[in-house]
Amino acid sequence: ALDTNYCFRNLEENCCVRPLYIDFRQDLGWKWVHEPKGYYANFCSGPCPYLRSADTTHSTVLGLYNTLNPEASASPCCVPQDLEPLTILYYVGRTPKVEQLSNMVVKSCKCS
Amino acid sequence: ALDTNYCFRNLEENCCVRPLYIDFRQDLGWKWVHEPKGYYANFCSGPCPYLRSADTTHSTVLGLYNTLNPEASASPCCVPQDLEPLTILYYVGRTPKVEQLSNMVVKSCKCS
């Protein structure tokens, strides 16, 4: 699987999950999030050669098409597969609120 | 929606579904598919600016991050959202077989 266990331990050029730390205040301008200050959102990148973690029959077909027609602009793209939530603390006036934001952390990638 | 109805009628630079005809024999080397000769597989391409058909909270966050950090390599990618099947005819020896291949035709795209 193209997950953090594999991708963070290997120098992988092809589609894989990459570490990306985002600081809420500095990178997003979100001053309203009090905890955490930031988090590892991660991201997916790298080429998608034929059959590499193909998401659907279409991505398999497109990968083969791209292999046999290398000048073509159509090719699968490396995108998130498994995502995890992130729990944040913020305030509404003086009242603290805790909320779980879904799909915030990329754990693995796929070619789609 | 970034679907064929919209994308095929507009000159859209950003993420959208694009027409792509694939000939099974010529483009994939699949001699075994007898009908159809080919089909419109289509594909997704184009930049994913902030909030454009964002698939998840992560893609929204990444789009904003990319807007505020334009030098960053991390950005959402334009990939298939809705896909449709394709029915094909092939032969196993002298016995005809009809099969519905799932997820063969891209009907709309998203930023993921």
């Epitope: - | 007898h34 009908e35 029915t87 005819l89 020896g93 002298r94 016995t95 005809p96 009809v98």
Partner: antibody, heavy 119, light 111 residues
């Protein structure tokens, strides 16, 4: 250009044997099924024998009229298909065509070779 | 085995005539939207020639005056305007199951 060249036909006595050959060129012989179709004088077309590709284990078919007497075989290294005809009868007299069916239709045909069974 | 019955078995027509030949199968030769019936032209001393494949698709190099239609058990070959070179015997053939079989043929003669 697809070419199918039959040979081996001729005059043979009842009970005798003949081996027809069909040399193919211009297509991927290994990938396709090959057939022998005949036309007896004043009759229609009849599929007498058929052999599919290696992918499908060289499965063969024979019409009831030739079963246990005729044998179809192929040599992929020579791109040739054969029809071994034993215990020939007068009713086997016909023009025998070699043909290739990439799908469900016989797309290409040889020029035919005449087999005459007569005493 | 699937039997194919062609009608008529022979017909006389003139150059320019519209000619229709039918082929009826003893059971359906269609699967899903695919119609597994094919048509051939056979002239004396020549090899048969594929005209139409899968009911309605014109084979390579065949003039557009030839057309095919039908589904299930009933199929038709039409020559819109008969030409001198079209006088021949026409056969239908199915590939719905093994064994593939031919129809008895329809001889098109000059009136």
């Amino acid at each position: 250009e697809v070419q199918l060249l039959e040979s081996g036909g001729g005059l043979v006595q009842p009970g005798g044997s003949l081996r027809l050959s069909c040399a193919a060129s211009g297509f991927d012989f290994n990938s396709y099924g090959m057939s022998w179709v005949r036309q007896a004088p004043g009759k229609g077309l009849e599929l007498v024998a058929d052999i599919v590709s290696k992918t499908y284990n060289y499965t063969t078919y024979y019409s009831d009229s030739v079963k246990d007497r005729f044998t179809i075989s192929r040599d992929n290294s020579k791109s040739t298909v054969y029809l071994q005809m034993n215990s020939l009868r007068a009713e086997d007299t016909a023009v025998y065509y070699c043909t290739v069916a990439p799908g469900g239709s016989f797309d290409y045909w040889g020029q035919g070779t005449l087999v005459t069974v007569s005493s | 085995d699937i039997q194919l019955t062609q009608s008529p078995s022979s017909l006389s027509a003139s150059v320019g005539d519209r000619v229709t030949i039918t082929c009826r199968a003893s059971q359906s030769v269609s699967i899903s939207r695919f119609n597994l019936m094919h048509w051939y032209q056979h002239k004396p001393g020549k090899q048969p020639k594929l005209l139409i494949y899968r009911a309605s698709n014109l084979a390579s190099g065949i003039p557009s005056r030839f057309s095919g239609s039908g589904s299930g058990t009933d199929f038709t070959l039409t020559i819109s305007s008969l030409q001198p070179e079209d006088f021949a015997t026409y056969y239908c053939q199915h590939s719905r199951e093994s064994p593939w079989t031919f129809g008895g043929g329809t001889k098109v003669e000059i009136k």
